[in-house]
């Protein structure tokens, strides 16, 4: 057989036995001559051992470049490949010789004691036990122990080859401590040497770099990268690093095994790469590869090297953030910088501190945004090394879906006297202001809330046939006034009013307000009654501790049995937008009240008096009257609101001012409180008395000093007092210039 590529001028060495395989018996002489065209050498099995004393290589007597190999009394162990080759080339001729020794069918190893086979238990992996044969066609099985198992060739993955040995799937013998080959010749068993089985791991579970990402340094700093490989047991690991600047003077690599807990099914290996002073050329990808021979796993990270410390805002930094009330707002501070900057947030110039509602860090998070969060937020980045600062302003606009103020104030069951003109109001607060407020209506009987009809929170009305107020056929004549804008409780609100010219039919009215972030609606139950009429004496809205009388007046010829009730707490709360059950049909929720009856020529008047009204007296009061003929009950409901007592407060400050003689001074002092406070003015702690030059108007709210004189200079005090106390503000008026002489002088 020929091995190697023939050169242009050289022929292959020629053997005297022109066969690939030669079979001879033991104890005979093996002699092969090799001829060629230049210096030749022989290689034979075991020729690295001491057996060459038996092997004789001689020069041929009949020519140059010829050598004869002779082995007298060959034994089984001489089985193998015999190669004749030209020195310093790959050109060779090979013959495989079987020395049939039936007493020793397996070729013994060099040590003749035992061999070692290394196996890995990965998928589709076979192992070769090198029990070579001196006979080519033996029936060989493999014995493994302990426990004892015998494996015979199955024609595929289990096989024996005299030149190679016994091949078997690794997993089949991984349990064994030792294996050997066995051949049967004429009922006689022959065994190879023993092979110790060593299971070698190969699995690498993972390779982790630390730090794993976002590594940034500036020139001159030290880089330390740790690469940890986790493997199964019985594994050895080789680490290999790839990095941008391979010819680094200050590079240091340290590899070591890490201790793992006893009983752990895992090993850990660590490789540490250190570069003492990085340069710009050290920027780039760093890759750590861990190899176990059968498996390689790698991991990479990018190292960024900056010329010097710096800080800047990233291009994605927002300048305007829009949100709706109740949302979570996140404003990230997007920056470029090394090292990471210190981040400080300010709102309208005031530093923000984190609490349960706001988190001020890399990201400014407002958990549930409210209107008061609207404003300008400034983020200041400070580089911790260079102290360089960068600032950026973010405007936060908080939108509010339409909220209708009266929703929470007005009872949904007020009654209105037949034929009267009534005004219904929706006061809408929204940011941005509503782009429209529309009114709708429908007849009360079309939407009667019968208990049999299913009403849910998602569909509060059994009828949804709302009609536009432009189409008032069959209903009350309506006029919608142009929207008004008013500053109420310090907020710009939109007021939409609907005027019912004559209250003729009971209906439901709905106002719907819409802006860019939502909608709000209010349903008003407009119940028209021809029955009793309720009035309040002396005031529509009494204050706590004041007395109030509720008068129920009914035509004596039509009605009888006038009774006052108070609507008690609902056993089931009315859901938003749900229609209440008509009170006359459900007297269970009413509390009967004591009242006094008076009469005049045409009417009965039932008066219910509340002395020292309290906040608990607020609620819906029902006057019930019975039709004398039909005995049908008529109810009128009036909501009573009791105003809370509030101590006086003065809104706005009096400003110190300087005025020239002869000019005028006008100042105002607006006070609020309940009961409304009395306003008094003082000059230098003396009560200010009106005269021709000093004018007090609007319940003393406005003070005017005409043609000021030098003696008008001084400390002016506005004091607002009620039974609940006083509030005051002060200002100093300076009068400049020389006093003009008057004519009288």
């Amino acid at each position: 057989a020929s091995v190697g590529l023939p050169s242009v001028s050289l022929d292959l060495p020629r053997l005297s036995i022109q066969k690939d395989i030669l079979t001879i018996k033991a104890n005979t002489t093996l002699q092969i001559t090799c001829r060629g065209q230049r210096d030749l050498d022989w290689l034979w099995p075991n020729n690295q051992s001491g057996s060459e004393q038996r092997v004789e290589v001689t020069e041929c007597s009949d020519g140059l470049f010829c050598k004869t190999l002779t082995i007298p009394k060959v034994i089984g162990n001489d089985t193998g490949a015999y190669k004749c080759f030209y020195r310093e080339t790959d050109l060779a001729s090979v013959i495989y010789v079987y020395v049939q020794d039936y007493r020793s069918p397996f070729i013994a190893s060099v040590s003749d004691q035992h061999g070692v086979v290394y196996i890995t238990e990965n998928k589709n992996k076979t192992v070769v036990i090198p029990c070579l044969g001196s006979i080519s066609n033996l029936n060989v099985s493999l014995c493994a122990r302990y426990p004892e198992k015998r494996f015979v060739p199955d024609g595929n993955r289990i096989s024996w080859d005299s030149k190679k040995g016994f091949t078997i799937p690794s997993y089949m013998i991984s349990y064994a401590g030792m294996v050997f080959c066995e051949a049967k010749i004429n009922d006689e068993s022959y065994q190879s040497i023993m092979y110790i089985v060593v299971v070698v791991g190969y699995r690498i579970y993972d390779v982790v770099l630390s730090p794993s990402h976002g590594i940034e340094l500036s020139v001159g700093e030290k880089l330390v990268l740790n690469c940890t490989a986790r493997t199964e047991l019985n594994v050895g690991i080789d680490f290999n690093w790839e990095y941008p600047s391979s010819k680094h003077q200050h590079k240091k690599l340290v590899n070591r095994d890490l201790k793992t807990q006893s009983g752990s099914e895992m090993k850990k290996f660590l490789s540490t790469l250190t570069i003492d002073g990085v340069t710009r050329s050290d920027q780039g990808l760093y890759t750590c590869a861990a190899s176990s021979g059968l498996m390689t796993k790698k991991n990479s990270t990018f190292v960024r090297v900056h010329e010097k410390p710096f800080v800047a805002f990233g291009s994605g930094m927002e300048s305007l953030v829009e949100a709706t009330v109740g949302e979570r707002v996140r404003i990230p501070a997007k920056y470029l910088g090394y090292p990471p900057p210190e981040i400080k947030w300010y709102k309208n110039g005031i530093p923000l501190e984190s609490n349960h509602t706001i988190k001020a860090g890399h990201v400014l998070t407002i958990m549930e945004v409210s209107e008061r969060d609207t404003g300008n937020y400034t983020v200041i980045l400070t580089n911790p090394i260079s102290k360089e600062k960068q600032s950026h302003v973010v405007s936060l606009v908080v939108y509010v879906p339409p909220q209708i103020g009266e929703k929470s104030l007005i009872s949904p069951v007020d009654s209105y006297q037949y034929g009267t003109t009534q005004t219904l109001t929706c006061t809408v607060y929204a940011i941005p202001p509503p782009h429209h407020i529309h009114w709708y209506w429908q007849l009360e009987e079309e939407c009667a809330n019968e208990p049999s009809q299913a009403v849910s929170v998602t569909n509060p009305y059994p009828c949804e046939e709302w009609r536009s107020v432009e189409d008032f056929q069959g209903g009350n004549k309506i006029e919608v006034n142009k929207n008004q804008f008013a500053l109420i409780e310090g907020k710009n609100k939109t007021v939409s009013t609907l005027v019912i010219q004559a209250a003729n039919v009971s209906a439901l009215y709905k106002c719907e307000a819409v802006n860019k972030v939502g909608r709000g609606e209010r349903v008003i139950s407009f119940h028209v009654t021809r029955g009793p009429e309720i009035t309040l004496q002396p005031d529509m809205q009494p204050t706590e501790q004041e007395s109030v009388s509720l008068w129920c007046t009914a035509d004596r010829s039509t009605f009888e049995n006038l009774t006052w009730y108070k609507l008690g707490p609902q056993p089931l709360p009315i859901h938003v937008g749900e229609l209440p059950t008509p009170v006359c049909k459900n007297l269970d929720t009413l509390w009967k009240l004591n009242a006094t009856m008076f009469s005049n020529s045409t009417n009965d008047i039932l008066i219910m008096e509340l002395k020292n009204a309290s906040l608990q007296d607020q609620g819906d009061y029902v006057c019930l009257a019975q039709d004398r003929k039909t005995k049908k009950r008529h109810c009128v409901v009036r909501q009573l609101t009791v105003l809370e007592r509030v101590a006086p407060t003065i809104t706005g400050n009096l400003e110190n001012q300087t005025t020239s003689i002869g000019e005028s001074i006008e100042v105002s002092c607006t006070a609020s409180g309940n009961p409304p406070p009395q306003i008094m003015w003082f000059k230098d702690n003396e009560t200010l008395v009106e005269d021709s030059g000093i004018v007090l108007k609007d319940g003393n709210r406005n003070l005017t000093i005409r043609r000021v004189r030098k003696e008008d200079e001084g400390l002016y005090t506005c004091q607002a007092c009620s039974v609940l106390g006083c509030a005051k503000v002060e200002a100093f008026f300076i009068i400049e210039g020389a006093q003009e002489k008057t004519n009288l002088e």
Partner: antibody, heavy 115, light 110 residues
Framework: SVEESGGRLVTPGTPLTLTCTVS????????MSWVRQAPGKGLEWIGI?????NTCYANWAKGRFTISKTSTTVDLKITSPTTEDTATYFC?????????????WGPGTLVTVSS | AVLTQTPSPVSAAVGGTVTIKCQSS????????LSWYQQKPGQPPKLLIY???TLASGVPDRFSGSGSGTQFTLTISGVQCDDAATYYC???????????FGGGTEVVVK
């Protein structure tokens, strides 16, 4: 050698167990797989039981079949047969570490599922 | 995994060459865990090739296999009448549960 048995006509939903009996094969060294073939259709690998008794099923077969073994037999239980399970079921010898190689097959046993 | 065999059926004259392709939806384990089987009517399948290209014992050397990863080929050169059968490829994967046969290719010998 390998031989399957237990194939018969069953009604849908009635559990059925097929048995594969081996001789001259050491089940503590070899893995055994079950493969089926619907009439006029191709082969479908069902699952394998390893020499150590671990089982693995084709993704489509999980929950529908159970494989178990003794020292000389390997069972395939069809938990709740449907008409789609009508097929010839083969038992084949393979290797723990090489699921996609079967070098000894049984002749097969026919299962018919019909109401 | 899905193994797609093409073409089917395939027709060949005695002495001709037949090539059957098998494409896998994902790479087989070790790029070579693919075997080929021959099945004749009424008989169980018979192993022809494993490890994509290793001839099973007792199989004539006119059968050969090639390919790696996702594309594999079974070639029958010098087709004989006895080669008329259906041929299946079988792939093994990282996850044993993905093991699957191809749909089969019927070889008709004229």
């Amino acid at each position: 050698s390998v031989e399957e048995s237990g194939g018969r006509l069953v009604t849908p939903g009635t559990p059925l167990t097929l048995t594969c009996t081996v001789s001259g094969i050491d089940l503590s060294s070899y893995a055994m797989s079950w493969v089926r073939q619907a009439p006029g259709k191709g082969l479908e690998w069902i699952g394998i039981i390893s020499s150590t008794g671990n089982t693995c099923y084709a993704n489509w077969a999980k929950g529908r079949f159970t494989i178990s073994k003794t020292s000389t037999t390997v069972d395939l239980k069809i938990t709740s047969p449907t008409t789609e399970d009508t097929a010839t079921y083969f038992c084949a010898r393979g290797y723990d570490d090489y699921v996609a190689l079967f070098n000894m097959w049984g002749p097969g046993t026919l299962v018919t599922v019909s109401s | 995994a899905v193994l797609t065999q093409t073409p089917s059926p395939v027709s060949a004259a005695v002495g001709g060459t037949v090539t059957i392709k098998c494409q896998s939806s994902q790479s087989v384990y070790n790029n070579n865990a693919l075997s080929w089987y021959q099945q004749k009517p009424g008989q169980p399948p018979k192993l022809l090739i494993y490890d994509a290209s290793t001839l099973a014992s007792g199989v004539p050397d006119r059968f050969s296999g090639s390919g790696s990863g996702t594309q594999f080929t079974l070639t029958i050169s010098g087709v004989q009448c006895d080669d008329a059968a259906t041929y299946y490829c079988l792939g093994g994967y990282d996850d044993d549960a993905d093991t699957a046969f191809g749909g089969g290719t019927e070889v008709v010998v004229k």
